[in-house]
Amino acid sequence: AWELTILHTNDVHSRLEQTSEDSSKCVNASRCMGGVARLFTKVQQIRRAEPNVLLLDAGDQYQGTIWFTVYKGAEVAHFMNALRYDAMALGNHEFDNGVEGLIEPLLKEAKFPILSANIKAKGPLASQISGLYLPYKVLPVGDEVVGIVGYTSKETPFLSNPGTNLVFEDEITALQPEVDKLKTLNVNKIIALGHSGFEMDKLIAQKVRGVDVVVGGHSNTFLYTGNPPSKEVPAGKYPFIVTSDDGRKVPVVQAYAFGKYLGYLKIEFDERGNVISSHGNPILLNSSIPEDPSIKADINKWRIKLDNYSTQELGKTIVYLDGSSQSCRFRECNMGNLICDAMINNNLRHTDEMFWNHVSMCILNGGGIRSPIDERNNGTITWENLAAVLPFGGTFDLVQLKGSTLKKAFEHSVHRYGQSTGEFLQVGGIHVVYDLSRKPGDRVVKLDVLCTKCRVPSYDPLKMDEVYKVILPNFLANGGDGFQMIKDELLRHDSGDQDINVVSTYISKMKVIYPAVEGRIKFSTGSH
């Protein structure tokens, strides 16, 4: 028998520095977690103590904090090289700055293979990107070899900016021939490493013949065997065992997100490359693990540029940006409109001639808007200003909901109106009218939504049985502020870009902004 230790991360999302327990900015260092310096300490400890170790990343290193905003992926290449990752799969967020934003900072600088078998380049891009990412890689580990085959969510064109010269094929269809090719090369230990979410990971384990282990990402899935060490609730045991169509037991793993845990899986193979046993658990990277001094020093060196950036002007406002709780928790506020407009703008993807865009709607809890921005400071807007408005380090995500769920959400928005509670919704691509004289649960008297399958966008009444795409904060997607119906009834959820980054990019693009209160939210006469 031959034993392999797989260490894995996924959806790190630019958390190079240690974070608080909820993966936001670290405040009390003695209780902070994760970060590349701490990760390196743990990885090095395991490499020292165990013979056959692979360090893998399942994508979405890009996007999530000011580190990515400023360094645009150079930080990912630099620190992943320093940690000596063995391989990485491309995630959807690796395309957030277009193909060029992937090629230059990461693909050309990484000293480890970057993989995806189901992304095929065409046209002029094919020769430019050739060899910079690979469908698979055979890695020597001790006296053996291990094949790693990569995959990426085929939804990436709807979630990021890969352009028109990359085709995202069905994962299973694309993986099978690559695994078959590895088998012909006498590689009998094969890991599928990819970024399509836990459901697809399980399907790959079931359907792709010859895959021994699946290491996934995208869905931020936390798996754990036993009593979990922090706040995350396990979606299943670690590893999650799938019985393949040809009768093999295939372990599937993921390690939550944000570098909070290091996935730790031990696999025992027989001489024919069959998995005999698999066990492990994610390791919580808490403060009992010291930060490696050399990596930490490097982080501090790179940090200097971030501090300078946060005070630079992104753009100007010529109007007061009303992000006060007195406004945003009671009525339409122009800060809410600005943020929702930025959220939609960030999700413009012209992928189908029948649709002007794939999504037109935004909802945003008023309680998530934490500060106004005064225009009387020469109109200047900085990252620092936006961090006061959106201090929680969340993301603006894409969900699919039925109209009936949206109706419930808007009823919840005003079910206890008047108490300055955070669930009051700010909107984009939606016109809502409330009648507060009616009983809670029956106060939405009009709900019109902007069409997407149209050449001239216009507002149509919400249809209860239709499925709609909506951009919203991850806080709402996870049922925050009492929006349990969203969490329970959503049909799809893809995590998006860092909230501040979305708004800052929009302001930089617009240069001068002047959002108005324009009648998106109305109250019927006599009730307000």
Epitope: T41, Q45, R48, P229, K266, G280, N281, N286
Partner: antibody
Framework: EVKLVESGGGLVQPGGSLRLSCAAS????????MSWVRQPPGKALEWLGF??????????EYSASVKGRFTISRDNSQSILYLQMNALRPEDSATYYC??????????????WGTGTTVTVSS | DIVMSQSPSSLAVSVGEKVTMTCKSS????????????LAWYQQKPGQSPKLLIY???TRESGVPDRFTGSGSGTDFTLTLSSVKAEDLAVYYC?????????FGSGTKLEIK
């Protein structure tokens, strides 16, 4: 007072099974790596394996001599460490010690030892 | 596996004498990342459980008398008792915790003349 007390030793036939327990007290059990070490009569110490702390996933490592036959587990709620021994052989006869490793990162030496429990494998 | 070799296997000394015992590892126990040697020393008195004396090759466990000193680096380590007392009658074991499986030396038995 920090204390480890083993129990469950005794006489067992070759091929038989035995479960040893180790009751821990005087410290936060969940924070510590716990090991089993044995010592055949008149011989040297042999590390059998450990179970990691809660933060590190409570996963296990074993020495080759017992891997597949012995299983280490822990009950964090009751602060008890277990050693399940199957397919016992005469050469497994020894005093079995439960040990603790310090809480600090990478300190895999043993700062607290139990009093030991004796296992005899004989027909 | 890392093999730990101890010498001598036994020695007899008079009370008040200085005693030195050695421990050699089959590979270096010095870890370049932190410049620490992953070696511990234990004392086991007759009929008792082992007791930690030294860790990181030279750091004395709290409560251990300062007549016990650990030294060495890489593959060669020494435990020195500067002035032996009658209560030091015991077997002394070294242990590496550099990599799995953790291994002990075969012990040095200290007898009092």
């Amino acid at each position: 007072e920090v204390k480890l007390v083993e129990s469950g030793g005794g006489l067992v036939q070759p091929g038989g099974s035995l479960r040893l327990s180790c009751a821990a007290s005087g410290f936060t059990f969940t924070d510590y790596y716990m090991s089993w070490v044995r010592q055949p009569p008149g011989k040297a110490l042999e590390w059998l394996g450990f179970i990691r702390n809660k933060a590190d996933g409570s996963t296990t490592e074993y020495s080759a001599s017992v891997k597949g036959r012995f299983t280490i587990s822990r009950d964090n709620s009751q602060s008890i460490l277990y050693l399940q021994m199957n397919a016992l052989r005469p050469e497994d006869s020894a005093t079995y010690y439960c040990t603790r490793s310090p809480i600090y990162f990478d300190n895999w030496y043993f700062d607290v030892w139990g009093t030991g429990t004796t296992v005899t494998v004989s027909s | 596996d890392i093999v730990m070799s101890q010498s001598p296997s036994s020695l007899a000394v008079s009370v008040g004498e200085k005693v030195t015992m050695t421990c050699k590892s089959s590979q270096s126990l010095l870890y370049s990342n932190n410049q620490k040697n992953y070696l511990a020393w234990y004392q086991q008195k007759p009929g008792q459980s082992p007791k930690l004396l030294i860790y990181w090759a030279s750091t004395r466990e709290s409560g251990v008398p300062d007549r016990f000193t650990g030294s060495g680096s890489g593959t060669d380590f020494t435990l020195t008792l500067s002035s032996v007392k009658a209560e030091d009658l015991a077997v002394y074991y070294c242990q590496q915790y550099y990599s799995y499986p953790f291994t002990f030396g075969s012990g040095t038995k200290l007898e009092i003349k």
